[in-house]
């Protein structure tokens, strides 16, 4: 009879990770008598997979039933494969002896290679906000890929962006991969409800794309443009000063009256109106009795936004002219601030 | 199902001869190593020989020179020929396959009596 | 010869009693060893081989464990069908050998 050869038909196997793997093996001869073995690896290192003679092996079960001594059928199939598992297979006859078994033949071996899913796509932005014009960085990282080929986009609004770096790791051979790309996003102040997205396409995805998003109404600040009118009110001896807090983003601001630079009033945002671009308008107001006052008031809305340095603007209340003559006759949304008399 | 059926067993002068037959059936004889078991009444077990699929053949000391055992796939027979038989060769044989992968004994015929003596 | 040496030679128990049958070599046998159950008049039947597979058909109250040259054959649960003899036998090595015996009897 001819001497036992030990048949792997397959060169390499492609698995999905999840699944299960499929290791074909087979003898061409029941002689000799001895034990089957899978090796993950070749030489003393090897890894071992499954033994017929002895062993728990919960992930592994055989093709056929290898108890019988008329079986030259040695596959095994590995159930849950993770990206951990990929590697040359070999499958090993022993022949029985004494005192250990020796190892008589081995396969050519089958490569396993596990297709591995990205994981969602996670953007992050800047730790702290920044203003219009100004640049941010966005990062985009994926783990746990197989095989390393990708590809990643990014994209502002649908539109595709082309300033950004990414990286594969690591650069050698690897059971799993992860990238890690960096994009740079110039801000504008209409970039409140914009959204930057970070694609990844991966051969496991079968052309669905994974995403990953940020919203830029975490990143930019949009600081306040104000303004401050005066108009007459019903009473011939009392001005309506009003500060119009606009375009401002986001809400978290404080605004403080100062009459001749003593505090007159603070108060918080609170019934904003928002606009179009999601950023925010806030009106307050002040009635002044400009009887009280023998000298010219100068009146100062100063307004602290997202914690940053306060920014404010003047409007100075000649009290020596009739009040229907001062400032602009601009009619302004009343938003419901408390009235202040100035005595 | 695996059967294992022996027969051929009796009385037998010492010095005499006798040939056990093994008939096999439920299984593909030819990929199967099979053995010969004895037992004298009353005591254990004694391995008394075993061929291999290659048709290789193993005896221990006790009956080696004495005992051939052979085997015709396309019969699916297996055979023990006893020559210059003993006293002491008085027992039940039995025919077993050897059914495991590592050649572990895994089905027994009923046995035939084989007794020697005068 | 490798010699096989079972312990107790015989052993009264009792219905649902767990009992342990020990099996000795004379040198290491590297596992290839199996357990047989025979009752009178009977063939031998195979219990457990390469020292703790169980054998097909075989309910799981029958336990084989041990390596090198001590092995061990446990019986969980005694049921009155499991009285019987049993052998230890050695295949690793022609000329194959088994054991004397146990004779397992109800007390």
């Known amino acids: 009879e001819e001497e036992l050869q030990v048949i792997q038909p397959d060169k390499s196997v492609l698995v999905a990770a999840g699944e299960t793997a499929t290791l074909r093996c087979t003898a061409t001869s029941l002689i000799p008598v001895g034990p089957i073995q899978w090796f993950r690896g070749a030489g003393p290192g090897r890894e071992l997979i499954y033994n017929q003679k002895e062993g728990h092996f919960p992930r592994v079960t055989t093709v056929s039933d290898l108890t019988k001594r008329n079986n030259m059928d040695f596959s095994i199939r590995i159930g849950n494969i993770t990206p951990a598992d990929a590697g040359t297979y070999y499958c090993v006859k022993f022949r029985k002896g004494s005192p250990d078994d020796v190892e008589f033949k081995s396969g050519a071996g089958t490569e396993l290679s596990v297709r591995a899913k990205p994981s969602a796509p996670v953007v992050s932005g800047p730790a702290a906000r920044a203003t219009p014009q100004h640049t941010v960085s966005f990062t985009c990282e994926s783990h746990g890929f197989s095989p390393r080929d990708i590809t990643l986009k990014w994209f502002k609004n649908g539109n595709e962006l082309s300033d950004f770096q990414t990286n594969v790791d690591p650069v050698g051979e690897s059971v799993s991969y992860s990238i890690h790309s960096t994009a740079k996003v110039v801000l504008t102040r209409e970039d409140v409800h914009s959204q930057v997205i970070c694609e990844v396409a991966h051969v496991t995805l079968q052309g669905d794309p994974l995403r990953g998003t940020a919203n830029l109404s975490e990143t930019i600040r949009v600081p306040p443009t104000l303004e401050v009118t005066q108009q007459p009110v019903r009473a011939e001896n009392q001005v309506n000063v009003t500060c119009q807090v606009r375009k401002f983003y986001p809400q978290r601001l404080q605004l403080t009256w100062l009459e001749n630079g003593n505090v007159s009033r603070t108060e918080t945002a609170s019934t904003v109106t928002e606009n179009k671009d999601g950023t925010y308008n806030w009106m307050s107001w002040l009635l002044v009795n400009v009887s009280a006052h023998r000298d010219d008031v100068k009146l100062t809305c100063q307004v602290e936004h997202d914690g940053q340095p306060a920014v404010s603007k003047s409007h100075d209340l000649k009290v020596s002219a009739h009040p229907k003559e001062q400032g602009s006759n601009t009619a302004a949304e009343n938003t419901g601030s408390n009235e202040r008399n100035i005595y | 199902e695996v059967q294992l059926v022996e027969s051929g067993g009796g009385l037998v002068q010492p010095g005499g001869s006798l040939r056990l037959s093994c008939a096999a059936s439920g299984f593909t004889f030819r990929s199967y190593d099979m053995d010969w078991v004895r037992q004298a009444t009353g005591k254990g077990l004694e391995w008394v020989s075993g061929i291999g699929i290659a048709g290789d053949t193993y005896y221990p000391d006790s009956v080696k020179g004495r005992f051939t055992i052979s085997r015709e796939n396309a019969k699916n027979s297996l055979y023990l020929q006893m020559n210059s038989l003993r006293p002491g060769d008085t027992a039940v044989y039995y025919c077993?396959?050897?059914?495991?992968?590592?050649?572990?004994?895994?089905?027994w015929g009923q046995g035939t009596l084989v007794t020697v003596s005068s | 010869d490798i010699q096989m040496t079972q312990s107790p030679s015989s052993l009264s128990a009792s219905v649902g009693d767990r009992v342990t049958i020990t099996c000795r070599a004379s040198q290491d046998i590297n596992n290839y060893l199996a357990w047989f159950q025979q009752k009178p008049g009977r063939a031998p039947k195979s219990l457990i081989y390469t020292a703790s597979r169980l054998q097909s058909g075989v309910p799981s109250k029958f336990s084989g464990s041990g390596s090198g040259t001590d092995f061990t054959l446990t019986i969980s649960s005694l049921q009155p069908e499991d009285f019987a003899t049993y052998y230890c036998?050695?295949?690793?090595?022609?000329?194959?050998?088994f054991g004397q015996g146990t004779r397992l009897e109800i007390k």
């Open positions: 036998q050695q295949y690793n090595t022609y000329p194959y050998t």
């Open positions: 077993a396959r050897g059914g495991g992968w590592d050649g572990s004994l895994d089905y």
